[in-house]
Amino acid sequence: CDLPQTHSLGNRRALILLAQMGRISHFSCLKDRYDFGFPQEVFDGNQFQKAQAISAFHEMIQQTFNLFSTKDSSAAWDETLLDKFYIELFQQLNDLEACVTQEVGVEEIALMNEDSILAVRKYFQRITLYLMGKKYSPCAWEVVRAEIMRSFSFSTNLQKGLRRKD
């Protein structure tokens, strides 16, 4: 499966929207930094097959969608930007779903990528617990936004790599 160029552009647009969503001066949030333990090894294209990497990307975008779809998230961010962000994520989910099913049979996906999907879910679980512990404070959301931007940037670079390998 060749990930369409539009997917990469969508990922870039999602990153730009995330960057625009900041509401407070992030300089006041240094003390709220936290180690979420981004599962970098899951996205390592050298260690895992393409289908597994794509499956992990899919899970990450799905979890990002879930995280930013909550009531607490809606209260934290600008509604217009959030809606645009949802559209970009939704489009990426569609691109990746088509790609995963093309790479391997649907019934094989769940078994084959169980570990990588679980690692991504645990990562987002840590993010959710952090937000809960910080009572969804503006700084906690800023830290999470920065973290999601970093993980998106990382996966975008790897997706470029996956396209080049074809």
Partner: antibody, heavy 121, light 107 residues
Framework: EVQLVQSGAEVKKPGESLKISCKGS????????IGWVRQMPGKGLEWMGI????????AYSPSFQGQVTISADKSISTAYLQWSSLKASDTAMYYC??????????????WGQGTLVTVSS | DIQMTQSPSSLSASVGDRVTITCRAS??????LNWYQQKPGKAPKLLIY???SLQSGVPSRFSGSGSGTDFTLTISSLQPEDFATYYC?????????FGQGTKVEIK
């Protein structure tokens, strides 16, 4: 390879203006903040201020607030430190350094080579 | 502002010695502390971040410990290239502040 390359040494007279630069390469310039650090001759390190190139938001040390201006041009991956009126006491080595922002990553992991500013009449 | 105080200001040691430098913060900074090495005419180099994490490429003879207000940088076996000035820096809040430095000299 991540690099921060600073502009060359400057010799100025008191009262003159100056703008020094720090160009980042080998990484996403807008994903990191750029901090500025002063080191006067034979002295220690002093943090001056920082900029987020993605939106040009800045924070200054109270000691340097109003004395210098930090700016950035993300289109050319460059941060700047400027003075409108130099004093002899501004004579120092000035370093720029990369900061991970709110991410859990090493602070000031890459530094520029430094720009020596000499202010003398 | 958070004050960072290093001790000693300077020390003399021999190659192979175990060297310990301490840094004290004027208030709790959790583990938001970094250690840098600077050699004459060169830019500082990050050694340790978040109190105890070794920066990539830094020899394992360097280690950091501590949390709250008291921190330590240890060089387990001093090498000729380790003679330099060492700075601690808090990164919990602005303004970011450095210790005054500890110069490690040859005995």
């Amino acid at each position: 390879e991540v690099q921060l390359v600073q502009s060359g040494a400057e010799v100025k007279k008191p009262g003159e203006s100056l703008k020094i630069s720090c160009k980042g390469s080998g990484y996403s310039f807008t994903s990191y903040w750029i901090g500025w650090v002063r080191q006067m001759p034979g002295k220690g390190l002093e943090w001056m201020g920082i900029i987020d190139p993605s939106d040009s938001d800045t924070a200054y040390s109270p000691s340097f607030q109003g004395q210098v201006t930090i700016s950035a041009d993300k289109s050319i991956s460059t941060a700047y430190l400027q003075w409108s009126s130099l004093k002899a006491s501004d004579t120092a080595m000035y370093y720029c350094a990369r900061h991970p922002g709110l991410n859990w990553a090493p602070d000031f992991d890459y530094w520029g080579q430094g720009t020596l500013v000499t202010v003398s009449s | 502002d958070i004050q960072m105080t290093q001790s000693p200001s300077s020390l003399s040691a021999s190659v192979g010695d175990r060297v310990t430098i301490t840094c004290r913060a004027s208030q709790s900074i959790a583990e938001f502390l970094n250690w840098y090495q600077q050699k004459p005419g060169k830019a500082p180099k990050l050694l340790i971040y978040f109190a105890s994490s070794l920066q990539s490429g830094v020899p394992s003879r360097f280690s950091g410990s501590g949390s709250g207000t008291d921190f330590t940088l240890t060089i387990s076996s001093l090498q000729p290239e380790d003679f330099a000035t060492y700075y601690c820096q808090q990164s919990i809040d602005f303004p970011l502040t450095f210790g005054q430095g500890t110069k490690v000299e040859i005995k």
